[in-house]
């Protein structure tokens, strides 16, 4: 069964800046990755970025930089300032659509005890 992993890290240099990394463990052709916060995309979450392997990347504030790390993993940096900036207990979710298996998603947040720079 395919799985999705999610890591959330607070940047040591900018305490309200986050890096989210997500990866897909499974076969099939990854067609789309959707990153959201505040819950899964289908359950009230707000989309931060959509990454397509051929048609490019779309991102919305406070997302600063979304990119493919490998063919099956992505990373997203969030801006740390402004009214829409995330807080330490924000939930981030990644949904990988793989053809023809379907969609697989997982969520993660910064552990409450984490020091800046530690990965979840």
């Amino acid at each position: 069964t395919p799985e999705v992993w999610v890591q959330v890290r607070m940047e040591a240099t900018e305490l309200s800046s986050f890096t989210i990394r997500c990866g897909f463990l499974g076969s099939g052709s990854i067609s789309l990755v959707t990153v959201s916060w505040g819950g899964p995309n289908g359950a009230g979450g707000t989309t931060l970025a959509v990454l397509h392997p051929e048609r490019g990347i779309r991102q919305w504030a406070p997302a600063r930089q979304a990119r493919w790390e490998t063919q099956s993993s992505i990373s997203l940096i969030l801006e740390g300032s402004g009214a829409s900036s995330p807080c330490a207990n924000t939930t981030f979710c990644c949904k990988f659509a793989s053809f023809p298996e379907g969609s697989w998603e997982a969520c993660g947040s910064l552990p409450p005890s984490s020091d800046p720079g530690l990965s979840a």
Epitope: S29, S31, G42, P100, E101
Partner: antibody, heavy 120, light 107 residues
Framework: EVQLVESGGGLVKPGGSLRLSCAAS????????MSWVRQAPGKGLELVSA????????YYPDTVKGRFTISRDNAKNSLYLQMNSLRAEDTAVYYC?????????????WGQGTLVTVSS | DIQMTQSPSSLSASVGDRVTITCKAS??????VAWYQQKPGKAPKLLIY???NRFTGVPSRFSGSGSGTDFTLTISSLQPEDFATYFC?????????FGQGTKLEIK
Amino acid sequence: EVQLVESGGGLVKPGGSLRLSCAASGFTFSSYHMSWVRQAPGKGLELVSAISRDGDSTYYPDTVKGRFTISRDNAKNSLYLQMNSLRAEDTAVYYCSRHEDYFGFAMDSWGQGTLVTVSS
Amino acid sequence: DIQMTQSPSSLSASVGDRVTITCKASQSVSNDVAWYQQKPGKAPKLLIYYVSNRFTGVPSRFSGSGSGTDFTLTISSLQPEDFATYFCQQAYRSPWTFGQGTKLEIK
């Protein structure tokens, strides 16, 4: 304008074979996953086969596994369905459809359908 | 396989009526639900994707809602051209499965 045109349907005896074709135009065929969906007379819709954009991944439900083979030729903008060991219950209109990644794999374009009748 | 149970299977209504069709999935399908309209002898046409997004050219009287396992297609004010059969579909896990259809007829 996106167009999908099926051909190859007809009357065939039980145990016989048919090869359906779907000619695509108006879009970059190699960028889209494709499927065959059938509809028996007066019945609902059933996915019978799916293939990824590069042709590397395929899917078949148990009802047709081992009898049907989906393939595509991206150079010819064509999708195929080879149907062997046909049964009376395979009688249906067969539609070629295109999956849109950005729409959660919803099928945003369909052909007009080709009728396959399996009868002695 | 994920089952999509659609209700009602048939429905009689008049022009101008507000109509609701429901679809229940046997397990959570996130927001990967689409709705299609099919007229006799024609191919299905995509109406709604991702639960609530109208496809290009679909009139605003069509709307979708729901989450998890329960989804709804609403036609706010029926027009003569809306009498057709409607199918829900989940595209969350293969095989993509469809509801059995709702035939909307003129009262």
